[in-house]
Every structure is written in C-alpha cells, then in structure tokens.
Interface confidence: low
C-alpha cells in the first residue's frame, strides 16, 4: 500500500514545537511529513478545532522525478502577535486515502512579566485624612504578588506580604508618591508613580462674630495642613437672592461672588460695604503651598437693619381754621431696613413739642382746638425702621390757607389715633 495509508504508520516526520512567551510575541510552529504520491493539504488544529483562517504556509518538495515518488511537505503556522486566544494545544491534520492523521501536539502558552490591570492614580487628599489606592496585575504566570512603595520605600518586607490590591493609607502630612511592583516567576513590572498631594483640611466652625448694618465680622477654625503652613484663607460672600438661593454644599455659586483674602492668623475677617438688612451666604477655604482646601458649606448670614439715612421728602403743611393738613413723601436716602412708619412732631412758639406716631401713612389732618391762633406753628417728620428713627426733617412752618390756594390733591385723613390738641 502507498506509504501513509496504513493506520499504524503516521506520515509525520516533524511535529510542532512549544512556544511560551509574553503578549505580542511573534512565533512559528512547524510540522513536516513525508508521503507518497499527491501531497495532501495540511490543516492546523488548536485544542482539536480546525483553524479556518490560519496564517499558514505549505511548502512541498519532490524527492524523485515521478510524481508518484515521495514528497516532503512542510507546513508553517505563524502567530503574528501572541494573544490570550492563541494559547492552547496545536497539531497538524492531513487526510490521506480514507484516513485522518494527526501530528504529536505542540503547546503555545502566554507567559511573561506581569501586566497591570489597574494602577495607582494621582489624587489630592486633605492632611491626616484616610484614603485608599488600588493596584492590580495579572500573569500568566500566576501568582502575581504586589509590593507597594511609598516615596520609593517598600511598605512590606517582601512581595505578597502586606497590602495587595488595595492600600489603605491612614493619612499623610506631606505630599508623597506611591507605586506598586508586580512580581511573578518571570520578573518584576513597576506601575506608574502616583503623586498624592496633601492639601489643608476644610476649615471648621465658620461663624459670625459681630454684625452691623453694612459690616459683618466672621471667624473660623483652620484645619490641619500637614507640614505646610497656611499662607492665607479666601472668603467668598454671595448675595442670597430668593430666586437664586444657594443650597448648602452647592459646589459653585450661580454668579460671581465677592472674594476676599485673609492673612492668617488671625482666622477672622471683617466684611465691609455690605447692604443693610440683606441675607448673604459666606464660605471659606484655606491655602498652603500645596493648594486650596475644600470650601466649607455656604453659611447663611444677614446684616441687621439700620435707621433711615435721610428724612422724609417734600413736606407740606397748610392750615385752614382749626385744621392742619400735613403730607410728605418717603425718604430718598436708603431706608436700611423695612420702613415701619413715620413720627411727626409739632410745636408752637411758646408751647411744648407734641410727638405723634403716624404709622405708614404719608399724610395727616390735625384737628386744632381753640381758635387756632397759636403763632409760629412748625412741623417735623422722621421715618423709622426696627433699628430706630432716621434724621428729622427741618421744621416746616404751618402756612395759613387762603381761598384760591390749591388744596392737597390726595385724600385727607382725619387723625383718629391720637387726641385733639389745644393750646392755652
């Protein structure tokens, strides 16, 4: 029978070798057979499955003149860049006559230096605050043991001892570098070096020390900053419009805040040129040579009310017999709070001053008892808020009303909240 058709006699004279290497390695597997007559096509198997798209080349060399003589057939399988999927058992397969022949197996394995799946990342942390770093590597070959280093100093006596995937750092007082080494049977791979920057802790206990209508004094307790002294603290103040509203902990204000720098110590700052009776939100952060701490939450504060800064305007006082008509307008100067009302004072030449609370009205009719012959009658008006009275207007003389003189156009209201007054 032609050579290679008997079950007990394999045509293979060279079997695939073994390849073990790292990812990306290029390698070639080779098998050789000797057959009589027409050379067969050589197929490659991986783990018993035919490789349909194998990158293989087949070379055939006749050993004689006649095509029925023996042929040497060489098939080479190229692995262009070793991947996980290439690993396995490789064999050559030929069909001769009515039989399959399979070569002895060769093995391809993926093996090299450890490969990092996760490496420590740069980050910022507050001084003396715990945090975690992560590092993960794999082979093959396994096992892969990790060794953490802080500022290039190993944190354990040997790889595999001490923390592995997660490194818990209870806190730092200076900016430090961390890396991890991955060790396996093939050697060592070093991760990237992560820089952990130590920032000052968030300031605590931001509070109000004193309040004035246009000024607030605030103080805070600085957080720890490690070995780096604080250079300054920054305070931001924000008008709290009802429409906008700053929520506690909101990272950034909706509009540009007023920003002030404070020398430290003392951890205290006076905020001037504020609006009276106005809600604000304030926050503070402190800076060292390493950077800015996180901001405190926004603290709601409010300036107190002040007194009106000017007297009522356009005061008019006229008299008609036993009645006096007085009217005025709101002060043009800032009220510095909520206007609660007006006080009116009038006085004759030789009579004591009479003080009245008019409320929020801007006009009053006074019923003068007697014949109304009191001479040199003058009127003063002042506006007031919860903080007190504003300045009084200059005295306005009460003029006699003559026919033809225009009566005030607004409604005259008879004063009922106080008794009628008469002069002796």
């Amino acid at each position: 029978a032609p050579r290679g058709t008997q079950a007990e006699e394999s045509p293979f004279v060279g079997n695939p070798g073994n390849i073990t290497g790292a990812r990306g390695l290029t390698g070639t597997l080779r098998c050789q057979l000797q057959v009589q007559g027409e050379p067969p096509e050589v197929h490659w198997l991986r783990d018993g499955q035919i490789l349909e798209l194998a990158d293989s080349t087949q070379t055939q060399v006749p050993l004689g003149e006649d095509e029925q003589d023996d042929w040497i057939v060489v098939s080479q399988l190229r692995i262009a860049s070793l991947q996980l999927s290439d690993a396995g058992q490789y064999q050559c397969l030929v069909f001769l006559g009515h039989q399959n022949f399979v070569s002895q197996p060769g093995y391809v394995g993926l093996e090299g230096l450890p490969y990092f799946l996760e490496e420590p990342e740069d980050r910022t942390v507050a001084a003396n605050t715990p945090f975690n770093l992560s590092c993960q590597a794999q082979g093959p070959p396994e096992p892969v043991d990790l060794l953490w280093l802080q500022d290039a100093v190993p944190l354990a006596t040997a790889p595999g001892h001490g923390p592995q995937r997660n490194l818990h750092v209870p806190g730092l007082n200076k900016t430090s570098s961390f890396s991890c080494e991955a060790h396996n049977a093939k050697g060592v791979t070093t991760s990237r070096t992560a820089t952990i920057t130590v920032l000052p802790q968030q300031p605590r206990n931001l509070h109000l020390v004193s309040r004035q209508p246009t000024e607030l004094e605030v103080a805070w307790t600085p957080g720890l900053s490690g070995i780096y002294p604080l250079t300054h603290c920054t305070l931001q103040a924000m008008l709290s419009d009802n429409e906008v509203g700053i929520q506690a902990g909101e990272p950034d204000p909706p509009e540009e805040p007023l920003t002030l720098q404070a020398s430290v110590p003392p951890h205290q700052l006076r905020l001037g040129s504020l609006h009276p009776h106005t809600p604000y939100h304030i926050r503070v952060a402190c800076t060292s040579s390493q950077g800015l701490s996180s901001w405190t939450h926004w603290l709601p504060v409010e300036t107190p009310e002040g007194v009106p800064l000017g007297p009522p305007e356009n005061i008019s006082a006229t008299r008609n017999g036993s009645q006096a008509f007085v009217h005025w307008q709101e002060p043009r100067a800032p009220l510095q709070g909520t206007l609660l009302g007006y006080r009116l004072a009038y006085q004759g030449q030789d009579t004591p001053e009479v003080l009245m609370d008019i409320g929020l009205r801007q006009e009053v009719t006074l019923e003068l008892q007697g014949d109304g012959s009191v001479s040199n009658l003058t009127v003063c008006v002042a506006a007031y808020t919860a903080a007190g009275d504003g300045p009084w207007s200059l005295p306005v003389p009460l003029e006699a009303w003559r026919p033809g003189q225009a009566q005030p156009v607004h409604q005259l209201v008879k004063e009922t909240s106080a008794p009628a007054f008469s002069w002796p």
């Epitope: 990306g24 999927s85 799946l117 490496e119 990342e121 993960q136 794999q138 995937r165 991760s191 990237r192």
Partner: antibody, heavy 114, light 112 residues
Framework: QVQLQQSGAELARPGASVKLSCKAS????????ISWVKQRTGQGLEWIGE????????YYNEKFKGKATLTADKSSSTAYMELRSLTSEDSAVYFC???????WGQGTTLTVSS | DVVMTQTPLTLSVTIGQPASISCKSS???????????LNWLLQRPGQSPKRLIY???KLDSGVPDRFTGSGSGTDFTLKISRVEAEDLGVYYC?????????FGGGTKLEIK
C-alpha cells in the same frame, strides 16, 4: 476559539431593573476580565466598567456608579450586568468585551419604555 | 477623564484611494511601563466593533496590511493605503492608559 455570547433583547419599564448576561467560552474564564460598553442608537461607545472573575473585583466609570452592578459566576463562565432605576436614557445596545477589546459579544438591545 | 478627539467626523473615499483618520488625546497616552495603550476599532453597520490595531501600530491577526497605525504621546493616525468596499463603517480610537478608559467619538467612512 474565544466567544462571548450575550443574552437576548430586553424590553423594560421605567424604574425597573434588568440583568444582562455574557457567557464566555474558548478560554479560561478566570484568567481575564470582562468589560461592558454602552452604545446609544447612532452614538459612540462608552465604557461602563469591567469585572475580574477570579477576584470578583469590579471597576466602574464614575458616570455609571449606582446605575450598573457587575458580577460574574465562575461555575457557568458567565458575566452579568444589572442596570437599575431604568429611564429612557438607558435604552441602548450593551456589549461585553475582553478588557483590551480583542473579542466582543454580539450586543444586547435594551429598550426602556412605558 | 482623558478626552479622545477624532477627525474628521465623516470621510468619503473612492475605492482604491487612501484614507487617513486622526485621533488626539487630552493627555499623553505613554504609560509608565513604556507602552502606549491606544487601539483602533472598526464597527461595520449592524455589527459589534472589531479591533484592528493595538498598542498604536500592531495589526490584529486577519487584518489586511493596508491598515497602518502610527503616532505617539497625544497624536495618533490610522491610515488605509487603498480603501476597499469592506472597509466602510465607523472607526473608533480607544485609550487604556488612564482610568477610566475612553473612546473617541468615531469617524464614519463612506464609499463614494
């Protein structure tokens, strides 16, 4: 050969949860990780996270923390991704893939609709 | 996160002509291990993505040698020497140097 076989299309109601699966074959399941990738219709690719079946450790893109939970069952060589509190924004094709993206599953279409 | 910016958005090429796609990263992709984890992927219409190139320039097995990848640091390029009909689809770049891994927005290759 390496294959990643994903579960079939899912239709879910807003607010519900869904669990997608990815069955691996052709290699040792515990040796390598499985990544998950989101692709909304006509959009690009977004990495959700990856899980390493040997340790069970999962790593997430910050954007998907709280939305996706990755798990793996070593006995069945299957990786899972659970998506919770579904909204229309979660309607997409979800792919599983090897960590360096040399192998991909065929994708699972998730439709969130009331 | 590292932003991967691909240009152009769409590329219309005649069969047999060359094509080039650019990918720029917001940070260097050179890792401390000396490797640059940048892949190119192709997603044909209605299919899963397929990796063409890894580590900037290494061709995956079965990928025709008309594809070449190049670049370093933050600038990378995928070139096709002679476009064929089977090349149409969306090409994505991907980086794995920095966590989290990120993809480019994609470049659609159309056949004129």
């Amino acid at each position: 050969q390496v294959q990643l076989q994903q579960s079939g299309a899912e239709l879910a109601r807003p607010g519900a949860s869904v669990k997608l699966s990815c069955k691996a074959s052709g290699y040792t399941f515990t040796s390598y990780g499985i990544s998950w990738v989101k692709q909304r219709t006509g959009q690009g690719l977004e990495w959700i996270g990856e899980i390493y079946p040997r340790s069970g450790n999962a790593y997430y893109n910050e954007k998907f923390k709280g939305k996706a939970t990755l798990t793996a069952d070593k006995s069945s060589s299957t990786a899972y991704m659970e998506l919770r509190s579904l909204t229309s924004e979660d309607s997409a094709v979800y792919f599983c893939a090897s960590p360096l993206f040399d192998y991909w599953g065929q994708g699972t279409t998730l439709t969130v609709s009331s | 996160d590292v932003v991967m910016t691909q240009t152009p958005l769409t590329l219309s090429v005649t069969i047999g002509q060359p094509a080039s796609i650019s990918c720029k990263s917001s940070q260097s992709l050179l890792d401390s291990d000396g490797k640059t984890y940048l892949n190119w992927l192709l997603q044909r219409p209605g299919q899963s993505p397929k990796r063409l190139i890894y580590l900037v320039s290494k061709l995956d097995s079965g990928v025709p040698d008309r594809f070449t990848g190049s670049g370093s640091g933050t600038d990378f390029t995928l070139k096709i020497s002679r476009v064929e009909a089977e090349d149409l689809g969306v090409y994505y770049c991907w980086q794995g140097t920095h966590f989290p891994q990120t993809f480019g927005g994609g470049t659609k290759l159309e056949i004129k």
